[in-house]
Amino acid sequence: YDFTNCDFEKIKAAYLSTISKDLITYMSGTKSTEFNNTVSCSNRPHCLTEIQSLTFNPTAGCASLAKEMFAMKTKAALAIWCPGYSETQINATQAMKKRRKRKVTTNKCLEQVSQLQGLWRRFNRPLLKQQ
């Protein structure tokens, strides 16, 4: 999906009102020095691409993020503020239902959510002049 035509300000508002707090809750008890961000993004569409990938694609050691509250709210925000996003996700959602697993918070998941927080920070405040 090409995130170029999303309403970035509305997505930012959704993130700051609820998603950010859910991420903080998920990370509660984790030391702020524990994880170094290794995933980066250069502009808002790129940030959303990386955010989508880390939030919804199962990875080795962390298969369960898509069921978390922050993930569901992220999906809702993208569905509302990115034209045509919902349609592209129907097949992915059906595939995910087949893979449904018990929710387990692993260290790998904590690391992944720390990466997500970093990506959202760059989405909210891209360093490039083209904001």
Epitope: L16, I24, E34, N37, W120, N124
Partner: antibody, heavy 119, light 107 residues
Framework: EVQLVQSGAEVKKPGSSVKVSCKAS????????IEWVRQAPGQGLEWIGV????????NYNENFKGRATLTADKSTSTAYMELSSLRSEDTAVYYC????????????WGQGTTVTVSS | SIVMTQTPLSLSVTPGQPASISCKAS??????VTWYLQKPGQSPQLLIY???NHYTGVPDRFSGSGSGTDFTLKISRVEAEDVGVYYC?????????FGQGTKLEIK
Amino acid sequence: EVQLVQSGAEVKKPGSSVKVSCKASGYAFSNYLIEWVRQAPGQGLEWIGVIDPGNGDTNYNENFKGRATLTADKSTSTAYMELSSLRSEDTAVYYCAREDNTGTAFDYWGQGTTVTVSS
Amino acid sequence: SIVMTQTPLSLSVTPGQPASISCKASQSVSSDVTWYLQKPGQSPQLLIYYVSNHYTGVPDRFSGSGSGTDFTLKISRVEAEDVGVYYCQQHHRFPLTFGQGTKLEIK
């Protein structure tokens, strides 16, 4: 506990350069932007620029472009702001600050470094 | 650059009374406004981010509102510890810019 500790006061001659350091602790240094802001005596706040310590990306206020250089050393968790071609109007307190967890504000500030430019 | 204009530049308030500071942007900054307080002899400290969100530990007597070009910081009941200079800041466009500051004194 997050802390930003800046280097001590400096007295410089016009035309010279100054390099202010900002040592971060209590968080993953590479993960958060470091901002630089200055405040002339009795004046308001003026943004100088920002650096991403993770990759060295920077963005400068045009008013300081060519004179200010922001760098970061990940091995020591220290950010630096160098200002060249100093003039008397550069006399100010220079602050480093960290972006907050959402990327929309500066949540931790250094104690400030006084730079005096005088002949 | 986006110019942030604060009014008033100073105000004197009796403890327990409300106070209000206005910040106007020269062009729309969406909701990308932050408020800081600089107490005498200290570094600035974060109060409110993204127009109306309280930073951790900030008393709820502080509140922020507005969008687009007009923003307001309100203190419902001023206390002696609230003295200092209040700054609004926009982070919608580079360069980031601050208002001139509003000095709050206690009567």
